[in-house]
C-alpha cells in the first residue's frame, strides 16, 4: 500500500504518500479551532506509471495507453484513497464544541 | 457535474471529461479482442483550482491551502468519478465469449 | 471588494418554507463563517445561526430551532437560510453577515442588502 | 441568554456635539481579556455596518470620530462632531455567549 510505512521511509518519485503539516491559522486562515493548532493532513504525489498501484480497470488500461502513446496527455493521476477523520474543539461563545471532520487526513494513496 | 454534457460543450481549462477513443490493436496491442475494435474510453485532465468540483474535506482544505500558498506543490488532482463497464466478444478457440470488464468508461471526473 | 448578494423579496402563505440566497464574492468563503439575522417591521436584530461553510457545520439560536436551516454550496459559494412553517411573526428583513473571522461566533462585517420576507394568505 | 440594555431609546444631537450611547449586559462579557462587545450603525433604508469591534477597536474604513469603551457589563459608544451623515440606529452586539444577542437601538 502507498501509505506512510512504505512511502515515509522509501525515496519515491511515483504515486506515493508526501507528509503536509496544515497550521489551521497560517495555512488556511480558519483562526476559531482551538485544538488541535494544525494536524498532518498529507497530501498524495508522484508519477503514475504503467501499472503503479492502478485503482481501476480505466486507469490500468490509460497506463497501457500512455506507454504506447507517451506523447499522449492522457495518464492516470495520483489520488487519495483512505481517508481518515480529525478531530477540533472550539467555542460557541464560552461553550466548548468538539465536531469530528471527515476525511480530513490521507493514509494511503493510488494511480486513478 | 463534470461528465459529457457539461465538458463537450464548454472549452474548459479546470478539470473536466475529456473524449478519448482508444483502438484495442493500435493502442494498447490487444488483437484478441473481436468486438468491438475500440471505444470512447474518455479520460480526466485539467487543473483543480480553488473548490473546483472538490470531492473531500480534504481535497477543499488542499485546494484552500494551495490558494493560500501557491507555491505549494500540494494541490488536489482531476480524476475520474462515475464510471462504466464495457462488454467485449473474443474467442477461445471457436467458442464465442462475452464479457463485461468494470469500470472501463469514464463519464465523469472530480478533484480529489 | 467583499460582496454578499441576496435574492429578492418573498411573499409566502402561513405554513409555507421560504429558502433565501446570499452569493458571496470577494473573498474565500470557506474560511470564514455566516451568519443570518433577521430584523422585524421597526424592530431591532435577531441572531438566528451560522453555518461554517467548509464543512456545513451549524449552530442555531434555540428561538428557531428546528424551523431554519442553513446550508451552503461551495461550489457557487453561495449560503442559503430556510424557514419553514411560516406565521405572520415571520414578517421581516433576513441579512446574511459574514463572520469577522477572530471565533466561531463573532462580530460581523460584511452584510448582506437583506430579503424582505413577507406572510399573507 | 445575555440580556442587552441600550440606553437612552432615542437621542437627538446637534451638528458638531459629541453623542454617547450606553450598553449593559445582563452578565459580563468578559473573556480570555477580551470584551466580547461590538457596536453597529444601521443607516435608514441599509443594512447595519460594523463600526467597533471588541469593545473599543475602530473597524477599517469606519472615522475616527467613533470610540467605544467599556467593559464587564458597562460599555459606552461615543461620536465626536455628529455630522447630519451619522443619522440611524446604532445597536451593541455581544458574542461571548451563545445565543449571540443584539441590544434594542438607539436611534
Known amino acids: 500500500a502507498l501509505d506512510a510505512a512504505y512511502c515515509f521511509r522509501n525515496v519515491q518519485d511515483n504515486c506515493c504518500l508526501r507528509p503536509l503539516y496544515i497550521d489551521f491559522k497560517r495555512d488556511l486562515g480558519w483562526k476559531w479551532i482551538h485544538e488541535p493548532k494544525g494536524y498532518n493532513a498529507n497530501f498524495c504525489a508522484g508519477a503514475c506509471p504503467y501499472l503503479w498501484s492502478s485503482d481501476t480497470q480505466h486507469s490500468r488500461v490509460l497506463s497501457l495507453y500512455n506507454t504506447i502513446n507517451p506523447e499522449a496527455s492522457a495518464s492516470p493521476c495520483c489520488v487519495s484513497q483512505d481517508l481518515e477523520p480529525l478531530t477540533i474543539l472550539y467555542y460557541i461563545g464560552k461553550t466548548p464544541k468538539i465536531e469530528q471532520l471527515s476525511n480530513m487526513i490521507v493514509k494511503s494513496c493510488k494511480c486513478s | 457535474a463534470l461528465d459529457a454534457a457539461y465538458c463537450f460543450r464548454n472549452v474548459q481549462d479546470n478539470c473536466c471529461l475529456r473524449p478519448l477513443y482508444i483502438d484495442f490493436k493500435r493502442d494498447l496491442g490487444w488483437k484478441w479482442i473481436h468486438e468491438p475494435k475500440g471505444y470512447n474510453a474518455n479520460f480526466c485532465a485539467g487543473a483543480c483550482p480553488y473548490l473546483w468540483s472538490s470531492d473531500t474535506q480534504h481535497s477543499r482544505v488542499l485546494s484552500l491551502y494551495n490558494t493560500i500558498n501557491p507555491e505549494a506543490s500540494a494541490s488536489p488532482c482531476c480524476v475520474s468519478q462515475d464510471l462504466e463497464p464495457l462488454t467485449i466478444l473474443y474467442y477461445i478457440g471457436k467458442t464465442p465469449k462475452i464479457e463485461q470488464l468494470s469500470n472501463m468508461i469514464v463519464k465523469s471526473c472530480k478533484c480529489s | 471588494e467583499v460582496q454578499l448578494v441576496q435574492s429578492g423579496a418573498e411573499v409566502k402563505k402561513p405554513g409555507a418554507s421560504v429558502k433565501v440566497s446570499c452569493k458571496t464574492s470577494g473573498y474565500t468563503f470557506i474560511t470564514y463563517w455566516m451568519n443570518w439575522v433577521r430584523q422585524a417591521p421597526g424592530a431591532g436584530l435577531d441572531w438566528m445561526g451560522q453555518?461554517?461553510?467548509?464543512?456545513?457545520?451549524?449552530n442555531y439560536n434555540e428561538m428557531f430551532e428546528g424551523r431554519v436551516t442553513l446550508t451552503a454550496d461551495t461550489s457557487t459559494s453561495t449560503a442559503y437560510m430556510e424557514l419553514s412553517s411560516l406565521r405572520a411573526g415571520d414578517i421581516a428583513v433576513y441579512y446574511c453577515a459574514r463572520g469577522y473571522g477572530n471565533y466561531a461566533l463573532d462580530a460581523m462585517d460584511y452584510w448582506g442588502q437583506g430579503t424582505l420576507v413577507t406572510v399573507s394568505s | 441568554d445575555i440580556v442587552m440594555t441600550q440606553t437612552p431609546p432615542s437621542l437627538s444631537v446637534s451638528p458638531r456635539e459629541t453623542a454617547s450611547i450606553s450598553c449593559r449586559a445582563s452578565e459580563s462579557v468578559d473573556s480570555y481579556g477580551n470584551s466580547f462587545m461590538h457596536w453597529y450603525l444601521q443607516k435608514p433604508g441599509q443594512s447595519p455596518q460594523l463600526l467597533i469591534y471588541l469593545a473599543s477597536n475602530l473597524e477599517s474604513g469606519v472615522s475616527d470620530r467613533f470610540s467605544g469603551s467599556g467593559s464587564g457589563t458597562d460599555f459606552t459608544l461615543r461620536i465626536s462632531r455628529v455630522e447630519a451623515n451619522d443619522t440611524g440606529v446604532y445597536y451593541c452586539?455581544?458574542?461571548?455567549?451563545?445565543?449571540?444577542?443584539f441590544g434594542q437601538g438607539t436611534k
Open positions: 453555518i461554517f461553510p467548509a464543512w456545513g457545520m451549524t
Open positions: 452586539q455581544q458574542n461571548d455567549e451563545d445565543p449571540l444577542s
